[in-house]
Interface confidence: low
């Protein structure tokens, strides 16, 4: 069952799934000037059996110079459901990954892929949050969100995370409720991860014992 909406937005934070549940779809998006090959699948699908999970289909992009359009090809509406968006660097390094039963790892980059990866998460998916550069967590319970099914509807649990910094006033835990989303951001606003060179964060995710190392900058 696909999740109906996006994970919650946390001010000055980004989220990342470190493993993807079977049933997760990843759109085969190409960067400007390239398109998905004519016979190529519109998405990759995390599938598997009891002992192994992997991504079905391979995304392939080809130059669209021979055509009079640079329009990106995306899944048809019936394939699309709600778009799950997280922008990330294509050269994200994954270290010391642990294979989780029923989960796929982060797919490797494909040639000429778009900078934005659009996932379609499924019920049971967990995403992990961390504060972006220059901000830090002050009030913390679990810094994660899980897509759950309740009364036939999907919802994401609220991560208990407040990121403060850049001379913003701080509150002692208990004085202020965690902020659920950035003020004034529309629901379609995406959490962005883009490359920077001088800041490395290593996040240890206790729930999965998987470490992912990447560089971030909030835009």
């Amino acid at each position: 069952e696909l999740c109906d909406d996006d994970p919650p937005k946390i001010t000055h934070a980004t989220f990342k799934a470190v493993a993807y549940k079977e049933g997760t779809m990843l759109n085969c998006e190409c960067k400007r000037g390239f398109r998905r090959i004519k016979s190529g699948s519109p998405y990759m699908l995390c599938t598997g059996n009891s002992s192994h999970s992997s991504w079905d289909n391979q995304c392939q992009c080809t130059s669209s110079a021979a055509r009079n359009t640079t329009k990106q090809v995306t899944p048809q509406p019936e394939e699309q459901k709600e778009r799950k968006t997280t922008e990330m660097q294509s050269q994200m390094q994954l270290a010391d990954q642990v294979s989780l039963p029923g989960h796929c790892r982060e797919p490797p980059p494909w040639e000429n892929e778009a900078t934005e990866r659009i996932y379609h998460f499924v019920v049971g998916q967990t995403v992990y949050y961390q504060c972006v550069q220059g901000y830090r967590a002050l009030h913390r319970g679990p810094a994660e969100s899980v897509c759950k099914m309740t009364h036939g509807k999907t919802r994401w649990t609220q991560p208990q995370l407040i990121c403060t910094g850049e001379t913003e006033p701080s509150q002692f835990p208990g004085e202020e409720e965690p902020q659920a989303s950035p003020d004034g951001l529309p629901e379609s606003e995406t959490s962005r991860l883009v490359t920077t060179t001088d800041f490395r964060i290593q996040t240890e995710v206790a729930a999965t014992m998987e470490t992912f190392i990447f560089t971030t900058e909030y835009q």
Epitope: Y129, Q130, C131, G134, Y135, R136, A137, L138, H139, R140, G141, P142, A143, L161, T164, G165, E166, T167, E168, F172, P173, D198, F199, I201, Q202, T203, E204, A206
Partner: antibody, heavy 121, light 106 residues
Framework: QVQLQESGPGLVKPSETLSLTCTVS????????WSWIRQPPGKGLEWIGY???????NYNPSLKSRVTISVDTSKNQFSLKLSSVTAADTAVYYC???????????????WGRGTLVTVSS | EIVMTQSPATLSVSPGERATLSCRAS??????LAWYQQKPGQAPRLLIY???TRATGIPARFSGSGSGTEFTLTISSLQSEDFAVYYC????????FGQGTRLEIK
């Protein structure tokens, strides 16, 4: 090898302002948080506050009204000012480097040797 | 504010023996806990973070365990240089330290 060194007067009069500086040598003050922590004689540790090289600060709420921490990146230094001191502020004051590892990021892997500040008239 | 309580206040153990120090949080701090060692006249030294991960350069005889509200620091075979004061510190909600456990030679 990064080292931290606290400096400042060892004796401050009651009601005056305590001022200390921490010099970071052997590395850049950028990309880490930097904290002040104190330890009254024979007692435990108390976190005072931190600063990021950008100037972002946060302070212990119990001391917030009296504390100012600032940074001078050109000198690789950060400073503590604690106003309206009393005898209860007598302590060894440490500066410390604050580990930065995503959201599990608030412990101290590098400390200065500490400087004793006595508040007395 | 989360209150960290360490026990015992003083622990007497012979060299070569095992020492077990306890730290209790007034509410859950998940695994956001660190341990420090402090010798007289010196600054604290980070031993353990994330409740169980040894810091760089810390001997394997030091180990941490626990999560939630109950934590333990174990020194498997005490060396002479291990006798010191040990502090736990939570970093789940801001920062608070325990009052310390003095480990002395029996």
């Amino acid at each position: 090898q990064v080292q931290l060194q606290e400096s400042g007067p060892g004796l401050v009069k009651p009601s005056e302002t305590l001022s200390l500086t921490c010099t970071v040598s052997g590395g850049s003050i950028r990309s880490y948080y930097w904290s002040w922590i104190r330890q009254p004689p024979g007692k435990g540790l108390e976190w005072i506050g931190y600063i990021y090289y950008s100037g972002s600060t946060n302070y212990n709420p119990s001391l917030k009204s009296r504390v100012t921490i600032s940074v001078d990146t050109s000198k690789n230094q950060f400073s503590l000012k604690l106003s309206s001191v009393t005898a209860a502020d007598t302590a060894v004051y440490y500066c410390a480097r604050d580990i930065l590892t995503g959201y599990s990021d608030w412990f101290f892997d590098l400390w200065g040797r500490g400087t004793l500040v006595t508040v007395s008239s | 504010e989360i209150v960290m309580t360490q026990s015992p206040a003083t622990l007497s153990v012979s060299p070569g023996e095992r020492a077990t120090l306890s730290c209790r949080a007034s509410q859950s701090v998940s695994s956001n806990l660190a341990w420090y060692q402090q010798k007289p006249g010196q600054a604290p030294r980070l031993l353990i973070y994330g409740a169980s991960t040894r810091a760089t350069g810390i001997p394997a005889r030091f180990s941490g365990s626990g999560s939630g509200t109950e934590f333990t620091l174990t020194i498997s075979s005490l060396q002479s240089e291990d006798f010191a004061v040990y502090y736990c510190q939570q970093y789940n909600n801001w920062i608070t330290f325990g009052q310390g456990t003095r480990l002395e030679i029996k």
